[in-house]
């Protein structure tokens, strides 16, 4: 049977650390971290760390019992936790039978928004007390609500991470731009800005509050050429105030309307 890992919390030092070992396994060859989305019973999503590691392909893995992973998180407060992943079988080969290094992973450290994490991992039995132990470490900074995975966090959803306003903006004439967008059930106040290098127009939008998405339209006066300008839509939801996720679009020319057929240049103009 191929070895797998069984992981569980281990807060203090590993018991092997107190023992003298003539030989110890080598260090890890690689350590990686990425956030993953997992569903929880409440129907909400939990964002966890997927920590994966690769074993060095040599005979020292015959001594390997476990790998210990510890994570320190630094944001508003500091957190620290460790797991010990025991190998279920002794290694009979230095590489997987199908080829490639032995690779394992553990999913389980919760990930908060915009937090710096320090992840350290070492093999067990580790080096003796007065020796430098082979270990691997890396820093991982979790992204914010714009990330394709983090956007599912409850805090991000309440800030509008899953809201797609589907902004369209077009230049009606030299003086006005029409902006259309889909509203969010999270709130009813929005600010639409038109800017090139500077702000050339803006408008507050207040829609009647309703618990469904509707299409809103606003015509914004502009002070200069607007074609190619950027539209920024800022929502003001109760949960995030003025710190909600902003969305952008680009001003294009409005399609011509009310012209049923192209003008025929040969036809005489009325009243001529």
């Amino acid at each position: 049977r191929e070895p797998t890992v069984q992981c569980g919390s281990e807060t203090g030092p590993s018991p092997e650390w107190m023992l003298q070992h003539d030989l110890t396994p080598g260090d890890l060859r690689d350590l990686r971290v990425e956030p993953v989305k997992t569903s929880v019973a409440t129907g909400d999503y939990s964002i966890l760390m997927n920590v994966s590691w690769v074993l060095r392909a040599d005979a020292s893995i015959r001594l390997l019992k476990a790998t210990k992973i510890c994570v320190t998180g630094k944001s508003n407060f500091q957190s620290y936790s460790c797991v010990r992943c025991n190998y279920t079988e002794a290694f009979q080969t230095q590489t997987r039978p199908s080829g490639g290094k032995w690779t394992f992973s553990y999913i389980g450290f919760p990930v908060e928004l915009n937090t710096v994490y320090f992840i350290g991992a070492h093999n067990i039995p580790n080096a003796n007390m007065n020796e430098d132990g082979p270990s691997m470490s890396l820093n991982f900074t979790s992204p914010g609500c714009l990330d394709h995975i983090m956007k599912y966090k409850k805090k991000c959803v309440k800030a509008g991470s899953l809201w797609d306003p589907n902004i369209t903006a077009c230049k009606k004439n030299e003086e006005t731009v029409e902006v259309n967008f889909t509203t969010s059930p999270l709130g009813n106040r929005y600010m639409a800005l038109i800017q090139h290098s500077t702000i050339i127009g803006f408008s507050q939008v207040s829609e009647p509050y309703q618990n469904k998405q509707t299409r809103a339209s606003v015509v914004i006066p502009v002070t200069e050429e607007s074609e190619g300008a950027m539209v920024q839509l800022t929502p003001y939801f109760p949960t995030c105030g003025s710190d909600c996720i902003r969305h952008k679009g680009t001003v294009v020319l409005c399609p011509q309307t009310g012209v049923p057929f192209p003008l025929d240049n040969n036809r005489s103009k009325p009243g001529g």
């Epitope: 003539d22 392909a57 040599d58 005979a59 020292s60 001594l63 230095q94 590489t95 199908s98």
Partner: antibody
Framework: QVQLVQSGAEVKKPGASVKVSCKAS????????MNWVRQAPGQGLEWMGR????????QYNQKFKDRVTMTRDTSISTAYMELSRLRSDDTAVYYC???????????WGQGTLVTVSS | DIQMTQSPSSLSASVGDRVTITCRAS??????LAWYQQKPGKAPKLLLY???NLADGVPSRFSGSGSGTDYTLTISSLQPEDFATYYC?????????FGGGTKVEIK
């Protein structure tokens, strides 16, 4: 059955390079490390390095690190060893040897004699 | 690097003799040791790995023992086809090194 077939004998001048090939058959090429071992005339065996055909990870003997290049082509199940800046004391038989479960050398090529002479 | 010291470097023996070759590692190699047989003009052939395990097709008159740093290859009853050079090799992590070899000659 497992077979490792090496390229033919080479005669090279000092300062030149030589590239030896080792074609594997009878097993899944990417599942085992391939080692290179050389033996000078009347001398013992010397490990030069190894390559993992799965991902091309290479570990060299420090003695050869600056002069040896190990590569592989998985499409034709072939490993290569190139030794540059040849000297007369590089005259030897060069063997490819496939690792077993760990790095004992379960299967060997027939050897390639490289003669370095001016 | 781990040094492998083999002794004797050569020996003379007769068919039917019991032959013992020793190999000492400069540090503990945790039984990660292999033995090879090589005949003139041929590639080495694996005899034993993990000290005691016989490779495929190797006769049972070959056996190995030892642990830590000291290891032994024994041929219980020497046969005519056994006259060759024998090498030990450690595989306790790269770089792998071989013993200097023991040439077994006909007395």
């Amino acid at each position: 059955q497992v077979q490792l077939v090496q390229s033919g004998a080479e005669v090279k001048k000092p300062g030149a390079s030589v590239k030896v090939s080792c074609k594997a058959s009878g097993y899944t090429f990417i599942s085992y490390w391939m080692n290179w071992v050389r033996q000078a005339p009347g001398q013992g065996l010397e490990w030069m390095g190894r390559i993992d055909p799965y991902d091309s990870e290479i570990q060299y003997n420090q003695k050869f690190k600056d002069r040896v290049t190990m590569t592989r082509d998985t499409s034709i199940s072939t490993a290569y060893m190139e030794l540059s800046r040849l000297r007369s004391d590089d005259t030897a038989v060069y063997y490819c040897a496939r690792s077993g479960g760990f790095d004992w050398f379960a299967y060997w090529g027939q050897g390639t004699l490289v003669t370095v002479s001016s | 690097d781990i040094q492998m010291t083999q002794s004797p470097s050569s020996l003379s023996a007769s068919v039917g003799d019991r032959v013992t070759i020793t190999c000492r590692a400069s540090e503990n190699i945790n039984s990660n040791l292999a033995w090879y047989q090589q005949k003139p003009g041929k590639a080495p052939k694996l005899l034993l790995y993990d000290v005691t395990n016989l490779a495929d097709g190797v006769p049972s008159r070959f056996s190995g023992s030892g642990s830590g740093t000291d290891y032994t290859l024994t041929i219980s009853s020497l046969q005519p086809e056994d006259f060759a050079t024998y090498y030990c090799q450690h595989f306790w992590g790269p770089p792998y090194t071989f013993g200097g070899g023991t040439k077994v000659e006909i007395k």
